[in-house]
Interface confidence: low
Amino acid sequence: TPEVWVQVQMEATELSSFTVHCGFLGPGSISLVTVSWGGPDGAGGTKLAVLHPELGTRQWAPARQARWETQSSISLALEDSGASSPFANTTFCCKFASFPEGSWESCGSLPPSSDPGLSAPPTPVPILRAD
């Protein structure tokens, strides 16, 4: 069964900068990735970025740069312009879609005990699965 993993990483040099890494484990060709925060996309979450393998990417503040790392994984750099970062206690969700087989979504967050520069371990939390 396909799975989605999510890692949230705080940058060691800039405590207001975070990077979300997401990947898809399974067969099939990824045709769309949606990253949201505050919950799953379409279920209370706010869209941060959309990545299309052929047509490029779109991102919305506070997302700074969304990019493909491999054919089945992406990264999203976030920058908080405020005095204190709201990202530490935030849930980030990644939805990977494979047309027309379906879509898979998992969420993750930065553990409270995480030191700057250390990434959180993979914490797949399946939200929605294709049947």
Epitope: G42, A97, L128, D131
Partner: antibody, heavy 120, light 106 residues
Framework: EVQLVESGGGLVKPGGSLKLSCAAS????????MSWVRQTPAKRLEWVAT????????YYPDTVKGRFTISRDNAKNTLYLQMRSLRSEDTAMYYC?????????????WGQGTSVTVSS | QIVLTQSPAIMSASPGEKVTMTCSAS?????LYWYQQKPGSSPRLLIY???NLASGVPVRFSGSGSGTSYSLTLSRMEAEDAATYYC?????????FGAGTKLELK
Amino acid sequence: EVQLVESGGGLVKPGGSLKLSCAASGFTFSSYAMSWVRQTPAKRLEWVATITSGDIRTYYPDTVKGRFTISRDNAKNTLYLQMRSLRSEDTAMYYCVGHDDFHFYAMDYWGQGTSVTVSS
Amino acid sequence: QIVLTQSPAIMSASPGEKVTMTCSASSSVSYLYWYQQKPGSSPRLLIYDTSNLASGVPVRFSGSGSGTSYSLTLSRMEAEDAATYYCQQWSSYPLTFGAGTKLELK
């Protein structure tokens, strides 16, 4: 302005063949996934076929798989649907549909449709 | 395949009245879309990704829901909104549509 103009519909006998065309304009055709959707006389909407923009993958529901073939000619901005072994249940209005870049699973652009009647 | 059941099949509303119609999925759905079709015209995309308004769609339309239960709401009925509304999913192969809700002007 986005325009999708279907043609090629008509009356055909059961077991016959028909090829539908869809001329696209007003958008970058080669970058869009395209589909055919039909509407039965009972007004039910049914997905018929989809072709992706880049690597030309095609998808069909079991009801038409092996009988229908979707294809595209990006140089001519034209979408096609080759229909073979037609059955009475294939009688419908056939719509050409364009899918928006980042929500191309949504059917953003629709043509006016071309009518196909399968009857002896 | 996922079956989408729309209710009611037919409904009527007076101008200014609030209208809500539902789309129930036989299994959990990730993406849901709503279309409007007026007599003699092609369907038109209203809502994508459950709650996002398509370009040019009046703000009186809104979509919501998750899992297997979704709804389309019209905050104030207008004469031009008389049409048939269809929901559609692609979360599971094959793509399927609901049978539609016909909204008439009272």
